[in-house]
């Protein structure tokens, strides 16, 4: 069976098994203060 790894969001292949979101958000940062 074929391994499913981190694939692009426009691919038909699922990204779930890679453990990574298909288009991860950039982590929000709080301003120092």
């Amino acid at each position: 069976s074929e391994t499913t790894t981190g694939t692009s969001s426009n691919s038909s292949q699922s990204t779930s098994n890679s453990g990574l979101a298909p288009n991860p958000t950039n982590a929000t940062t709080k301003a120092a203060g």
Epitope: G6, S8, S11, L20
Partner: antibody
């Protein structure tokens, strides 16, 4: 069977360069994002870089600490991913792994940056 | 960056007992597709990490069902029931929802 086999690594002086390579087999490489992760006693596990697919125009992402110094690239015809590291610093020392995501990991290769 | 905090740092258990490891993130790991990209890895000394669990609770192939992942949002747990000698090593959680992906500091499981 999925295999990720690395080459490269070793001892390099601060300010120097090193290129790591990783050859993949056992899965459809052209459909897979590829990543480099490093590990050190001081910082633990640290995601370094990611490269996406041809259909994504080989988009890349880097952790802030390596931006402008490291370049991830891939050659789909060779099922290979590379990490070119320039202007190396002592804090870049560690074991470098190539990974498909969180699921498959190479054996790791050690980079030591020291004078 | 999303801060991932694991506790305890070291866990000393008797063979046959249950071990529990906590992983907390500074931001929710729930992605817009309804999935939560929280993974658990295991590493023995001198070896590369091996994934045990993905999407909070899904066991990888070959991982015994003694391992259970649970949680949601920012709070996650790995439970190892009936601990065996082969379970000793370091366990890491890693989030794949936000870039840069970030790891917990690890929990070393020791056998009493």
């Amino acid at each position: 069977e999925v295999k990720l086999e690395e080459s490269g690594g070793g001892l390099v002086q601060p300010g120097g360069s090193m290129k790591l390579s990783c050859v993949a087999s056992g899965f459809t490489f052209t459909n897979s994002w590829m990543n480099w992760v490093r590990q050190s006693p001081e910082r633990g596990l640290d995601w370094v870089a990611q490269i996406q697919l041809k259909s994504d125009n080989y988009a890349t992402r880097y952790v802030e600490s390596v931006k402008g110094r490291f370049t991830i690239s891939r050659d789909d015809s060779k099922n290979s991913v590379y990490l070119q590291m320039n202007n190396l610093r002592a804090e870049d020392t560690g074991i470098y792994y190539c990974t498909t995501g969180t699921d498959y990991w190479s054996q790791g290769t050690t980079l030591t940056v020291s004078s | 960056d999303v801060v991932v905090t694991q506790t305890p740092l070291t866990l000393s258990v008797t063979i046959g007992q249950t071990a529990s490891i906590s992983c907390k993130s500074s931001q929710s790991l729930l992605f817009s597709n309804g999935k939560t990209y929280l993974n658990w890895l295991f590493q023995r000394p001198g070896q590369s990490p091996k994934r045990l669990i993905y999407l909070v609770s899904n066991l990888d192939s070959g991982v015994p069902d003694r391992f259970t992942g649970s949680g949601s949002g920012t709070d996650f747990t790995l439970k190892i029931s009936r601990v065996e000698a082969e379970d000793l090593g370091v366990y890491y959680c890693v989030q794949g929802t936000h870039f840069p992906y970030t790891f917990g500091g690890g929990t070393k499981l020791e056998i009493k």
